[in-house]
């Protein structure tokens, strides 16, 4: 706004920075025993793994960036149980990785499938 | 681990996932006026941008990824306030962003400066 | 399987320095925070530090401040404590022990004595 | 630095019999993520330690079902439902949910 009162280039710097901060699905790093909630005596090597989720900024402040469509993405693990009784099995995990989101109402009234962060 | 039993490639991939989640500087995208404590009558366009915060996984699930070092970055963004008596001014807005990270434990005892996230 | 090999024992003057080497074998090495613990004769565990292997950061007890140094060679998993200005209460069983995820130390090399005495 | 009180120092026990050693934090070990980081050790004369119990209850890998964590906040118990001649040794409690991590001073098992 107020275009004609600032410097076209500032403008176009400050457009660029909110488009890139605007909700899409952004790679992050999540716990997968606690994404899968297993029990303590259950886990993985590596404990972490890089998937999309939603994130970033909406217009309005009673907005949430959420997730409209999910995919699940397998990642090979070595799954652990303790007390250890065999080798330590590689196993194909499935995470949910978001490939869609969008500015919704924390109490979405629409039939979207939302998986929350 | 376990190398001995299993396909070199496929460690090598899951090693590879690994390092990609280790804790790290990551651009992140934060909202100006709760990071600066502004009141609610001031809000900023755009109202969020993107900097480098520390995430990611650590080695021990009693570690977490903080910030060891931090620089200031400079963001021109518009800052109003309402109601609203003036043109929305353009204003340099200095916003943290991480430089250095380290897995720490979460009530350090030794003298290391933190700003917590 | 997961095994740690430690150094052999070392006599050392006081006031000179030892390296104690611990080789990593059986996982992977820059998985795991390694720990180093010490162990005077007749007495119980003394917890000197930790790091991780895969980017050198580490984290020392402040009782050792200054005088201790670990490091890590990723190209041989090996680790390395270094402990200098040794006084005769040094004199003790050094141990590297790999810690999981969860925070306990477990698996352990079979400890290094190191005797300080002129 | 958190104090690890273990009691008793020594405990003599008759084979087959249950026996139990008790651990005391000087804080809360119940870590801002909810988890409690307290560990039991067992340490056979001439042996490195080995690991027996991690986060209160869970038994380590090779560990038999005879041994048992239980306890939460400062108060924490080790127990054997029958002791063998090959439990014999000293066994340490410990704590990774503070830096710097503290050990206990040690519960000497012995036969009666």
């Known amino acids: 706004f107020a275009a004609t009162f600032y410097d076209i280039e500032t403008l176009k710097v400050i457009d660029e920075e909110w488009q890139r901060t605007q909700c899409s699905p952004r790679e992050t790093c999540v716990e997968v025993a606690s994404e899968l909630g297993k029990s303590t005596n259950t886990f993985f090597k590596p404990p972490c793994v890089n998937v999309f989720r939603c994130g970033g900024c909406c217009n309005e402040e009673s907005l949430i960036c959420m997730n409209t469509s999910t995919s699940y993405i397998s990642k090979q693990l070595f799954e652990i149980s303790v007390p250890l009784t065999s080798v330590p099995e590689l196993v194909p995990v499935k995470v949910a990785n978001h490939t869609g989101c969008k500015c919704l109402p924390t109490a979405p009234r629409h039939p979207y499938s939302i998986i929350r962060r | 681990f376990a190398a001995t039993f299993y396909d070199i490639e496929t460690l090598k991939v899951i090693d590879e996932e690994w390092q990609r989640t280790q804790c790290s500087p990551r651009e992140t995208c934060v909202e100006v006026a709760s990071e600066l404590g502004k009141s609610t009558n001031t809000f900023f366009k755009p109202p969020c941008v993107n900097v480098f915060r520390c995430g990611g996984c650590c080695n021990e699930e009693s570690l977490i990824c903080m910030n060891t070092s931090t620089s200031y970055i400079s963001k021109q963004l518009f800052e109003i306030s309402v109601p609203l008596t003036s043109v929305p001014e353009l204003v340099p807005v200095k916003v943290a962003n991480h430089t250095g990270c380290k897995c720490l434990p979460t009530a350090p005892r030794h003298p290391y400066s933190i700003i917590r996230r | 399987q997961v095994q740690l090999v430690q150094s052999g024992a070392e006599v050392k003057q006081p006031g000179a320095s030892v390296k104690v080497s611990c080789k990593a074998s059986?996982?992977?090495?820059?998985?795991?925070?390694m720990y180093w613990v010490r162990q005077a004769p007749g007495q119980g565990l003394g917890w000197m530090g930790y790091?991780?292997?895969?980017?050198?950061?580490?984290t020392y007890n402040q009782k050792f401040k200054g005088r201790v140094t670990m490091t890590t060679d990723t190209s041989t998993s090996t680790a390395y404590m270094e402990l200098r200005s040794l006084r005769s209460d040094d004199t003790a069983v050094y141990y590297c022990?790999?810690?999981?995820?969860?925070?306990?130390?477990?698996?352990w090399g079979r400890g290094t004595l190191v005797t300080v005495a002129s | 630095d958190i104090v690890m009180t273990q009691t008793p120092l020594s405990s003599p026990v008759t084979l087959g019999q249950p026996a139990s050693i008790s651990c005391r934090s000087s804080?809360?070990?119940?870590?801002?993520?909810?988890?409690?980081?307290l560990h039991w050790l067992q340490q056979r004369p001439g042996q490195p330690p080995r690991l027996l119990i991690y986060?209160?209850?869970n038994r380590f890998s090779g560990v038999p079902d005879r041994f048992s964590g239980s306890g939460a906040g400062t108060d924490f118990t080790l127990k054997i439902s029958r002791v063998e001649a090959e439990d014999m040794g000293v066994y340490y409690c410990s704590q990774s949910t503070h830096v710097p991590r503290t050990f206990g001073q040690g519960t000497k098992l012995e036969i009666k």
């Open positions: 790091i991780d292997p895969y980017n050198g950061d580490t």
């Open positions: 022990a790999r810690t999981s995820y969860y925070g306990g130390m477990d698996y």
């Open positions: 986060k209160v209850s």
């Open positions: 804080q809360s070990l119940v870590h801002s993520n909810g988890n409690t980081y």
């Open positions: 059986g996982y992977t090495f820059t998985g795991y925070n």
